[in-house]
């Protein structure tokens, strides 16, 4: 009743290991770390066989097969590199995830290195089996902005890719009788969200009620340079239109809004987000220089009344930009208080422009980003949104442009986007 001697499988062992095995003796076959017992094409951790009465074993010895983690999961906006020859995916093989640079960056500066574990799962030291996240890089145009000229009014043509966050927002309100059409600018914050001014997305009513336009009436163009040629641009419809709940049409306080795009847009040299600032009640420091781009009025001799009556005919075809200094708050408040009309400059606003005039943002630039370069992070940060200006024509002497102070709304923006600030740290000015 003695059974034949057993040979353990390659990369495996049998327990108990004995010189002789008799009727009713049982052995357990297991494999080394990184290998699995394979019996009749079925993988298992262990396999038991028994010495039968007739001196034969109940089953043949199974084989040990190396664990295979199989093809790794695809990473959105990322790439996979195999570190092991022949693109092996077996035990102890290594792969490296990376993000599509320079448009995406890995969250928390993760190494992206994953090793095939004994359990047959790709594992990372920090994230475990979870895949890394590729977040859009912000505030780093593919084309570096030129040395800032002192001088849109008094602006200059922007080269394609200089302002990759710039969005053209077109509102065609077909629910109005007759239909209403207008436009403004916005800034890309992520692949799915546009930041703009609330007054751009408020229904142009005959009363002062604040009601957002229907999402169906909003189209967003990204990567656009010349408004006469939209073929190279990405156009997207809106999934949501969110106005700040406290937006006040009477003084334009809280003039900030968001558009969620129907589908995330692919990022590239002409479509990249801008960075949000830190939560900072002070806002940008006086005399700091910022840039604003827009397709608004670029003719300094056109009056506001002419602009309003001529509709879109006075637009710039090519995106314009202008460099403007931040004006001390007290100086701006004083310049507006001296004017007839209710022109209160609140703590949620800041001003920019030149005392002597000649350079300014204008109608049609509304909602566009006033960006300042942050030396620490080497990124462009949206500090303001084009909001309003005085009763005189754009670029008039001592009539500063007024901008929404974005740094007062960082928490609100993250909340609307449904992302806790800590999760999206690369998006924040550092």
């Amino acid at each position: 009743n003695e059974c034949p001697e057993l040979q353990p499988p390659v990369h495996g062992k049998i327990e108990p290991s004995q010189a002789k095995y008799f009727f009713k003796d049982q052995v357990l076959v297991s494999c080394d770390t990184g290998y699995k017992v394979l019996k009749d094409n079925v993988e298992m951790d262990t396999f038991q066989i028994e010495c039968l009465k007739d001196g034969t074993w109940s089953n043949k010895i199974p084989t040990c097969k190396i664990v295979d983690c199989r093809a790794p999961g695809e990473l959105e906006h990322g790439l996979i590199t195999f570190s092991t020859r022949n693109n092996l995916t077996t035990y102890k093989s290594e792969i490296k995830y990376s993000c599509q640079e320079p448009y995406y960056k890995m969250l928390n500066n993760n190494t992206g290195i994953y090793t095939c574990s004994a359990q047959g799962v790709w594992m990372n030291k920090v994230l475990g089996r979870s895949l890394p996240t590729c977040l859009p890089e912000c505030g780093q145009p593919s084309r570096s902005l030129p040395s800032l000229v002192k001088r849109i009014i008094g602006g200059r043509n922007a080269e394609p890719g200089l302002f990759p966050w710039q969005a053209l927002i077109v509102v065609e309100d077909t629910s109005r009788v007759p239909n209403d059409k207008w436009f403004g600018s916005g800034a890309l914050l992520s692949a799915s969200w546009i930041l703009t001014a609330a007054h751009v997305l408020r229904s142009q009513r005959r009363d002062t009620t604040v009601i957002p336009v229907s999402k169906e009436h909003v189209t967003v163009y990204l990567g656009l340079h010349d408004v006469r040629d939209k073929s190279g641009a990405v156009n997207s419809s809106a999934a949501r239109v969110v106005l700040h709940p406290d937006f006040n049409i009477q003084n334009y306080n809280h003039d900030i809004a968001l558009v969620q795009l129907q589908e995330p847009v692919p990022l590239g040299p002409h479509v990249m987000p801008v960075c949000l600032p830190r939560l900072e009640p002070e806002g940008p420091a006086p005399h700091m220089l910022g840039l604003v781009a827009g397709w608004g009025i670029s003719n300094p001799n056109v009056t506001v009344d002419e602009i309003i009556s001529s509709g879109t005919r006075t637009l710039s075809d090519v995106l314009q930009y202008v460099k403007l200094p931040v004006v001390p708050h007290a100086e701006c408040k004083t310049s507006y208080e001296s004017r007839s009309g209710n022109y209160s400059v609140t703590e949620n606003m800041f001003c920019a422009g030149y005392y002597e005039g000649g350079k300014d943002t204008c109608l049609g630039d509304s909602g566009g980003a006033f960006v300042i370069f942050d030396d620490l992070s080497q990124r462009w940060v949206v500090q303001g949104l084009v909001s309003w200006g005085g009763p005189e024509e754009c670029g008039s002497k001592q009539v500063y442009g007024v901008y929404t102070k974005v740094s007062n709304y960082v928490d609100w923006v993250w909340e609307q986007m449904g992302l806790p600030q800590s999760v999206v740290e690369p998006q924040v000015e550092r």
Epitope: V177, H199, R206, I211, S214, I249, G341, N342, Y343
Partner: antibody, heavy 114, light 112 residues
Framework: QVQLKQSGPELVKPGASVKLSCKAS????????INWVKQRPGQGLEWIGW????????KYNEEFTDKATLTVDVSSSTAFMELHSLTSEDSAVYFC???????WGQGTLVTVSS | DIVMTQSPSSLAVSAGEKVTMSCKSS????????????LSWYQQKPGQSPKLLIY???TRESGVPDRFTGSGSGTDFTLTISSVQAEDLAVYYC????????FGGGTKLEIK
């Protein structure tokens, strides 16, 4: 074409309530608020309130907050105004309007009498 | 609350004449940000519903004859009918939409 069709005249007893309707057609009902206006015989116009069908938001003239309740039925593109605790002072023609007063209903005469 | 005062309460003119009527508000209806005055003018003919003539103080509603002109800013507004026609017999109301809505008492236009 745009139309606002209001319900027919009502003769109601003092203390009772009445519900007037305003059926809209020919435009985007949910995107335009409905206003209600009162006009007593030989008198001027008084704004009662408005309702925004997209989300049911209402705004009232303070003098009518306890008197009128505005509702909508989006499925039938119809706005309603219920008037409560009626007195002879409520005898009037009630108009609905929409698309920011570009279009008006023909009016509903409400007579409160015992 | 904003109070709207119209004057005169009634006036009689002959066909072809120019007529002006006034509407004053107890506070400014101008919003400097939008550069608009939130004031409308309505015409109500006998036995009919009101009809919108002018909004934002001076913008003529589609289909309204160009003999009707709205002007003014802040607290003082005027409706002018350049050459009165027999069919203009009506009561004319102004309405503020700066803070909710308030109608003026109306100006009754009679044709001599």
């Amino acid at each position: 074409q745009v139309q606002l069709k209001q319900s027919g005249p009502e003769l109601v007893k003092p203390g009772a309530s009445v519900k007037l309707s305003c059926k809209a057609s020919g435009y985007t009902f949910t995107s335009n608020d409905i206003n209600w206006v009162k006009q007593r015989p030989g008198q001027g116009l008084e704004w009662i309130g408005w309702i925004y069908p997209r989300d049911g938001t209402t705004k009232y003239n303070e003098e009518f907050t306890d008197k009128a309740t505005l509702t909508v039925d989006v499925s039938s593109s119809t706005a309603f105004m219920e008037l409560h605790s009626l007195t002879s002072e409520d005898s009037a023609v009630y108009f609905c309007s929409s698309v920011e007063d570009s279009y008006w209903g023909q009016g509903t005469l409400v007579t409160v009498s015992s | 609350d904003i109070v709207m005062t119209q004057s005169p309460s009634s006036l009689a003119v002959s066909a072809g004449e120019k007529v002006t009527m006034s509407c004053k508000s107890s506070q400014s209806l101008l919003i400097s940000r939008t550069r608009k005055n939130y004031l409308s003018w309505y015409q109500q003919k006998p036995g009919q519903s009101p009809k919108l003539l002018i909004y934002w103080a001076s913008t003529r509603e589609s289909g309204v004859p160009d003999r009707f002109t709205g002007s003014g800013s802040g607290t003082d507004f005027t409706l002018t009918i350049s050459s009165v026609q027999a069919e203009d017999l009506a009561v004319y109301y102004c309405k503020q939409s700066y803070n909710l809505y308030t109608f003026g008492g109306g100006t009754k236009l009679e044709i001599k």
